[in-house]
């Protein structure tokens, strides 16, 4: 399987945005890559977002996706927005080399994203 590396821990900022790099060791020479972010919480795995991109081009997520990203070589810079405390969990990067063949797939160990909801501002008299 293809090796995928990602940071162990990331802290979301006060606006609920977290960014991390997903890096893969490509065994071949892929021109089309699919990146999927999975969230694992309480042994449940759900897909957060996915994008397929051509090497050298921008990642294109669906319009309503909470993810954005850029690619550079074998690195993908992923940003997840709109996170709240309840979204704290393990975010796993899955990379698939789609074209040309052969197909390769790799899954990272996951990035634990901690999200702390901002304290509401106290009312001022």
């Amino acid at each position: 399987a293809m090796h995928v590396a990602q940071p162990a821990v990331v802290l979301a900022n006060s606006r609920g945005t977290a960014s991390f790099v997903c890096e893969y060791a490509s065994p071949g020479k892929a021109t089309e890559v699919r990146v999927t972010v999975l969230r694992q919480a309480d042994s449940q795995v759900t897909e957060v977002c996915a994008a397929t991109y051509m090497m050298g081009n921008e990642l294109t997520f669906l319009d309503d996706s909470i993810c954005t990203g850029t690619s550079s070589g074998n690195q993908v810079n992923l940003t997840i927005q709109g996170l709240r405390a309840m979204d704290t969990g393990l975010y796993i990067c899955k990379v698939e080399l789609m074209y040309p063949p052969p197909y390769y797939m790799g899954i990272g160990n996951g990035t634990q994203i901690y999200v702390i909801d901002p304290e509401p501002c106290p009312d001022s008299d």
Epitope: P27, G28, K29, E32, T52, E96, M98, Y99, P100, P101, P102, Y103, Y104
Partner: antibody, heavy 114, light 112 residues
Framework: EVQLLESGGGLVQPGGSLRLSCAAS????????MSWVRQAPGKGLEWVSG????????GYADSVKGRFTISRDNSKNTLYLQMNSLRAEDTAVYYC???????WGQGTLVTVSS | QSVLTQPPSASGTPGQRVTISCTGS?????????VHWYQQLPGTAPKLLIY???NRPSGVPDRFSGSKSGTSASLAISGLRSEDEADYYC???????????FGGGTKLTVLG
């Protein structure tokens, strides 16, 4: 278990047409590049045509370009090869393969003869 | 004529080690693409033997090994057995053809 089942082969006259189908199961068909590879009697393997997972990229061997058309239906897990203007030299066993020929079907025989 | 060049035949006695070469060019093996090897026993469909230069699918004995260097690749079979008598093919992606290319095949004969 991965299974690839080809059908549609048979005897056809020169200039005629045939449509081969390959029903796939046991893997996520929509993730993989798929190919047709043929083997003429007593000869080696020849890649005929291939198609990417999304159908965006298609390729053909020079020997079949303009005569054969590859397509796929990911909702039906099926690969197709439309063969027109068939020639005697197209006589072969046609194999359906997934990825870079990671898995192979058992093949279907196409005989072009008058 | 095949884009990948293989010797048409090879032979060895039981227990011996034999090597089959596969020579390509800068648009396929030399471009960094992975080489794959297939075994075709008489009257059967080909079967994947080596995946991605040197990886064996489950069920393939470790007597079979692959390697790649520059624009060439090799398949080695050690401890040759009579059941290894078959045709062997290499294959790789080719940039200039936008497709897969196969070697012409090597017929392996196990003597004695």
């Amino acid at each position: 278990e991965v299974q690839l089942l080809e059908s549609g082969g048979g005897l056809v006259q020169p200039g005629g047409s045939l449509r081969l189908s390959c029903a796939a199961s046991g893997f996520t068909f929509s993730d993989y590049y798929m190919s047709w590879v043929r083997q003429a009697p007593g000869k080696g393997l020849e890649w005929v045509s291939g198609i990417s997972w999304s159908s965006r990229d298609k390729g053909y061997a020079d020997s079949v370009k303009g005569r054969f058309t590859i397509s796929r239906d990911n909702s039906k897990n099926t690969l197709y090869l439309q063969m027109n203007s068939l020639r005697a030299e197209d006589t072969a066993v046609y194999y359906c393969t997934t990825d870079l020929a990671r898995y192979w079907g058992q093949g279907t025989l196409v005989t072009v003869s008058s | 004529q095949s884009v990948l060049t293989q010797p048409p035949s090879a032979s060895g006695t039981p227990g011996q080690r034999v090597t089959i070469s596969c020579t390509g060019s800068s648009s396929n093996i030399g471009a960094g693409y992975d080489v794959h090897w297939y075994q075709q026993l008489p009257g059967t469909a080909p079967k994947l033997l080596i995946y991605g230069n040197d990886n064996r699918p489950s069920g393939v004995p470790d007597r079979f090994s692959g390697s790649k260097s520059g624009t060439s690749a090799s398949l080695a079979i050690s401890g040759l057995r009579s059941e290894d008598e078959a045709d062997y093919y290499c294959a790789v992606w080719d940039d200039s053809l936008n497709g897969v290319v196969f070697g012409g095949g090597t017929k392996l004969t196990v003597l004695g």
